[in-house]
Interface confidence: medium
Amino acid sequence: GPVPPSTALRELIEELVNITQNQKAPLCNGSMVWSINLTAGMYCAALESLINVSGCSAIEKTQRMLSGFCPHKVSAGQFSSLHVRDTKIEVAQFVKDLLLHLKKLFREGQFN
């Protein structure tokens, strides 16, 4: 059956933790991605931003997991109005910002 939202969020958080904790060099060679608003629709926005990073195996699992939270199909080059399209940040910072926000949501019981 479908994975409970709390379990899916916990698994996503654990993958983000895994990525941040295991960095020995700049993540994805320091690739830059568009910053996003960490509000409603952030899962799709996060995926739209990260999907434009290619050749970075470290975030492939995160990309797959985010697709499970996003109701529509996302492809490279696709952007929604949720993006703050004037700011680019390193993938490492993007992942960490997302991690901190999701941990807050989990603590507050906001699983969807």
Partner: antibody, heavy 122, light 108 residues
Framework: QMQLVESGGGVVQPGRSLRLSCAAS????????MHWVRQAPGKGLEWVAV????????HYADSVKGRFTITRDNSKNTLNLQMNSLRAEDTAVYYC???????????????WGQGTMVTVSS | SYVLTQPPSVSVAPGQTARITCGGN??????VHWYQQKPGQAPVLVVY???DRPSLIPERFSGSNSGNTATLTISRVEAGDEADYYC???????????FGGGTKLTVL
Amino acid sequence: QMQLVESGGGVVQPGRSLRLSCAASGFTFRTYGMHWVRQAPGKGLEWVAVIWYDGSNKHYADSVKGRFTITRDNSKNTLNLQMNSLRAEDTAVYYCARAPQWELTAEAFDIWGQGTMVTVSS
Amino acid sequence: SYVLTQPPSVSVAPGQTARITCGGNLIGSKLVHWYQQKPGQAPVLVVYDDSDRPSLIPERFSGSNSGNTATLTISRVEAGDEADYYCQVWDSSSDGVVFGGGTKLTVL
């Protein structure tokens, strides 16, 4: 309220053993990772060991590996540290501490016990 | 294993701002926690996850973390803030906790 109380400290000769205990109350013990942290007189904090919430994983500082064993009894809300082959450099205040836990990493220590003093001396 | 470097001491006048640093390789990618310890007492968590504060900790305590340095900032310092402060991270390479050496904050 949420509380951790250590016991079992004392004076022991080098090479001997000692068992520390930590009694937890006021929270759901079985859902938290538990740690031991020590502090030698006049020195900084040194992490000693962690045991996962369900006891499935245990990790130790290199300085105590092979000599110390961390265990827990979730039915009794207790954490233990069996210390064997004690050395003078193990002299310290030993704190137990609680840490919320993800699968791969510990969180911050949000509750600490008051500490119990262990002195290793001949 | 992972190493965290703190200055041994920081001095500040009452009412001023104290900044305590914690250096580590790519520490900005890790989650940093800070503890306050007064003489004869157990440590107390003052900042977790880089910049979050436990509910009982005053807003004067804040944290930041990027690059190779994490910083604990204490604004409008009071005499009661005099203590030792420790940063801490989880080191995945050793599956253990790492503390910085500690910084003694002196309020002049």
